[in-house]
Each structure stands twice: as C-alpha cells, then as structure tokens.
Amino acid sequence: DAEFRHDSGYEVHHQKLVFFAEDVGSNKGAIIGLMVGGVVIA
C-alpha cells in the first residue's frame, strides 16, 4: 500500500556553521574546528 500524504516527522532548525583556526604555538601547528550551534564538532 502507498503511504498517505503527511509532513515529515521532524523540523529543520537552521544554525550557523563557523569555521575557525586557532594558533596554539610555534611548533604545535594549528587546530581547525567546526562549531555548530555553539558546540565544536570537528
């Protein structure tokens, strides 16, 4: 049987994605991160 029409069961919340690079010292390279909604995820 085909499904009857209904909206998707979730809402899409738009959030800012912020890329950042942080210098952590002359010989330690840099940390590159991705912050989603205030949480660093990568």
């Epitope: 049987d1 085909a2 499904e3 009857f4 029409r5 209904h6 909206d7 998707s8 069961g9 979730y10 809402e11």
Partner: antibody, heavy 123, light 112 residues
C-alpha cells in the same frame, strides 16, 4: 468557527452520476497543509474513505473506487466537489466531508465533519 | 488494504463503569515520518463522527480526560475510565497512514 455542509441530489437512478458539494467556512483551502476528504456510510453500516484533496490540488483516492471518483475544489468559493459515476443501489449511503490539515503543529486528523447528506440510488 | 479489527463489536456497560476497546491492524501503520496515524472517532446516534484521539494517544480539544488511547505497531486500545451517558454510541478506530485509509467495523457502547 469551522463548519462543513454537504449537499447532493437525494435520489438518483442506477447508472447515473452523483455530484456532491461540500461547502465550508472557518478555514481556507488556500492555507498551506489544508485538505478536505469525502467519506460514506451505508445505512446501518460502517464508514468508508473515498477521496481527499489538498490545498495544492494533490489528490488521493480509494483504489477500489478510483475509476469512478473525481474530487475537485473551488478555493475562492470554499467548496469541494465529488463525482461518482455509474451509481448503483449499493452506493446508497450518507456521504460526509471532513477537514484534515497537514503539519507538525496541526492535528493531522479529521477534526471537523459535515452533517452528511443522504443519497439513495433506486430505479 | 490495511484491515482494522475491533473488539468487541458490542460493549454493554453500566454508567460509571470502565470500558476498553481493542483495535488491531493487519500490518504496521507506522508512517515513514515516524508517526502512527491511528485515530478514534465516536459516532453518536443520528450524528456525524467526531474526533476523540489522534496519533494513538493525543486527545482532541474538548475531549474529557476520562478518554485515553494507547498502543503501538499493530495493537491499539481506547479506554474510558468511567462511562457517562454522553459516551454512548459507536466507536471507530481509523488508520490514516496507508492508502486506502480504513476504519474498523465499529464498537457499539450501550447500556446493559
């Protein structure tokens, strides 16, 4: 407040085409997610879903009757129509229309029904 | 088609009694969006159906809290904690997940 009211011919002969109108108020079929469906109930029996039409003119039919059914709407007049071709005495029933609205913040159920219109098919 | 099987078909009660109606679907009515569109309607004598419960367990506006719905998958129940005179009529379960949309045969709640 939301109201729906069905109208039809009352009596018609076998092989004729039934034309039903659902006239409603308190909501608009131009509203995103809004829809109106048709149902019927033979005397002393249970309910059967027939068809549904959405604000964007998408339509859904009961496959067992699809070849005989046509649902349509006039958004500006707040009306939904159902035609059933080749009527037979077994199609004798009370015909109802009801509202159903899609949406995460909607009930998404038949929350308002019309009073029904009785249709008798007899030679 | 999804067959909705209600039991009992007749339910004699005394006012103030609890009542329970079972509804089983012939296959899962879990929609791909994660919702189960199982609804309960009451049709009082000479009237149109009226919505009581939607999405298994949600009471429609104005429905007394003595009505409750539960279940999942293929097994659903409507309970009335204490039957009142205005509750008498025929109760239909309904699935709105799969085409064709289908009703149960109805359960007649009547006085003993």
């Amino acid at each position: 407040q939301v109201t729906l009211k069905e109208s039809g011919p009352g009596i018609l002969k076998p092989s004729q085409t039934l034309s039903l109108t659902c006239t409603f108020s308190g909501f608009s079929l131009s509203t995103s997610g809004m829809g109106v469906g048709w149902f019927r109930q033979p005397p002393g029996k249970g309910l059967e879903w027939l068809a549904h039409i959405w604000w964007d003119d998408d339509k859904s039919y009961n496959p067992s009757l699809k070849s005989r059914l046509t649902i349509s709407k006039d958004t500006s007049k707040n009306q939904v129509f159902l035609t059933i071709t080749n009527m037979d005495p077994v199609d004798t029933a009370t015909y109802y229309c009801a509202r159903r609205q899609l949406g995460l913040r909607s009930i998404d159920a038949m929350d308002y029904w019309g009073q029904g219109t009785t249709v008798t098919v007899s030679s | 088609d999804v067959v909705m099987t209600q039991s009992p078909l007749s339910l004699p009660v005394s006012l103030g009694d609890p009542a329970s109606i079972s509804c089983r679907s012939s296959q899962s009515i879990l929609h791909s969006n994660g919702n189960t569109y199982l609804e309960w309607y009451l049709q009082k004598p000479g009237q149109s159906p009226q919505l009581l419960i939607y999405k298994v367990s949600n009471r429609f506006s104005g429905v007394p809290d003595r009505f409750s719905g539960s279940g999942s998958g293929t097994d659903f129940t409507l309970k009335i904690s204490r039957v009142e005179a205005e509750d008498l009529g025929v109760y239909y379960c309904f699935q709105g997940s799969l085409v064709p949309l289908t009703f149960g045969a109805g359960t007649k709640l009547e006085l003993k």
